[in-house]
Interface confidence: medium
């Protein structure tokens, strides 16, 4: 009871919800639910019945494996999906799949908050701007990743001459996609003309 699997997919993709084990032999009934009590599809005595739901026309059940195919998933499809199987013995068994649908991240824009010579070094404050998304940030100076301590939307650092990089890249990513934005400086400490 209560097996829970997590799945993260990109919006617009086709998804297969299935379990990693074999279905009980000769089960009597199989039902997929959306958020616990809303039936999506039910297989009973060798036929499938699709219920009126937002999935109608977008789902297909494979009774052999119990897999539920959903086409063109959207963020609104985020939910816990439950497959309940009624065995010949009358016992029920259920599996849960928590589906997270994420949009691809947009391309970030790097904004120069501050750049100045400081004690013969270069003080740099860059922000990585994307529309309200929950994402991870990775900053690179040329090809070198900055340390974990600097991985948020604002890069603030003071570089000594031997550590200057020409270009700074912000990589934004979620578990389904990633995009880069880059800004280049003219050494030692000025914005390059584009």
């Amino acid at each position: 009871q209560g097996h829970l699997v997590h799945m993260t997919v990109v919006s617009g993709s086709n998804v297969t919800l299935n379990i990693s084990e074999s279905l009980p032999e000769n089960y009597k009934q199989l039902t997929w639910f959306y958020t616990f009590d809303q039936k999506i599809v039910e297989w009973d005595s060798r036929k499938s019945k699709y219920f009126e739901s937002k999935f109608k026309g977008r789902v297909r059940l494979d009774p052999q494996s119990g897999a539920l195919y959903i086409s063109k998933v959207q963020k609104e499809d985020n939910s816990t999906y439950i497959m309940r199987v009624l065995k010949k013995t009358g016992n029920e068994q259920e599996w849960k799949i928590k589906l997270q649908v994420l949009d691809p991240v947009p391309k970030p824009v790097i904004k120069i908050e501050k750049i100045e010579d400081m004690d013969d070094n270069c003080y740099l404050k860059l922000s990585c701007v994307i529309p309200g998304e929950s994402v991870n940030y990775t900053w690179y100076g040329d090809k070198r990743p900055f340390p974990k301590e600097l991985q948020n939307s604002v890069l603030e650092t003071t570089l000594m001459p031997h550590n200057y990089s020409r270009c700074y890249t912000c990589q934004v990513s979620n578990s389904v996609s990633s995009k880069n934005g880059t800004v280049c400086l003219s050494p030692p400490c000025t914005l390059a003309r584009s």
């Epitope: 004690d119 404050k125 340390p147 301590e149 603030e156 650092t157 000594m160």
Partner: antibody
Framework: EVQLVESGGGLVHPGGSLRLSCAAS????????MSWVRQAPGKGLEWVSL????????YYADSVKGRFTIFRDNSKNTLYLQMISLRAEDSAVYYC???????????WGQGTLVTVSS | EIVLTQSPGTLSLSPGERVTLSCRAS???????LAWYQQKPGQAPRLLIY???SRATGIPDRFSGSGSGTDFTLTISRLEPEDFAMYYC?????????FGQGTKVEIK
């Protein structure tokens, strides 16, 4: 010349609190990340905490998380470490250090001794 | 986290001798982001080498660093009386920053 001078160490009972200070001079303090590193008597060096130049980001070693707070007053060119719920294993010389490009520590202050004992 | 192991623990040597200190990492240190510090009794550590092989400002050229990946070396070509001290390596390729346990160079 860059100078870092720590103060505020002393003897404290287990469970007690202490605030360390580090006065900085000779550089533009607000432009640099700063760190605390400690050294237990006769032992090696252990990174404790880090704060970004603006003070907007702070990071801690697992051993002190939830008990120590690093903060800074850029108008006073001073770095602080507030320590609560102190344990015997926190006994050490505490050094403040300029965190060079978030890489290595250069230079260091002379250190202040914290002793946690009943 | 990356564990750094320094060897030997102690070296007993005479002034004028050549010294080689070893620092071995439990996993590869990216881009040779390794520093060496010197610490004398009652004093703060002092940066000697960064980037595995670059000498810090004001450090005499008898100090040199080498290595990459998991094996790094600090060499003192000719020991001066003021070089007897503790030496620590530190990696800054990944978080948290970690230090080796140190090597003591003492007068024989």
């Amino acid at each position: 010349e860059v100078q870092l001078v720590e103060s505020g160490g002393g003897l404290v009972h287990p469970g007690g609190s202490l605030r360390l200070s580090c006065a900085a001079s000779g550089f533009t303090f607000g432009g640099y990340a700063m760190s605390w590193v400690r050294q237990a008597p006769g032992k090696g060096l252990e990174w404790v905490s880090l704060i970004s130049g603006s003070g907007g980001s702070t990071y801690y070693a697992d051993s002190v998380k939830g008990r120590f707070t690093i903060f800074r007053d850029n108008s006073k060119n001073t770095l602080y470490l507030q320590m609560i719920s102190l344990r015997a294993e926190d006994s050490a010389v505490y050094y403040c250090a300029k965190y060079s490009n978030y890489d290595y520590f250069d230079p260091w202050g002379q250190g202040t001794l914290v002793t946690v004992s009943s | 986290e990356i564990v750094l192991t320094q060897s030997p623990g102690t070296l007993s040597l005479s002034p004028g001798e050549r010294v080689t200190l070893s620092c071995r990492a439990s996993q590869s240190v990216s881009s040779s982001y390794l520093a060496w510090y010197q610490q004398k009794p009652g004093q703060a550590p002092r940066l000697l080498i960064y980037g595995a092989s670059s000498r810090a400002t004001g450090i005499p050229d008898r100090f040199s660093g080498s290595g990459s990946g998991t094996d790094f070396t600090l060499t003192i070509s000719r020991l001066e009386p003021e070089d007897f001290a503790m030496y620590y390596c530190q990696q800054y390729g990944s978080s948290p920053r970690t230090f080796g346990q140190g090597t003591k160079v003492e007068i024989k």
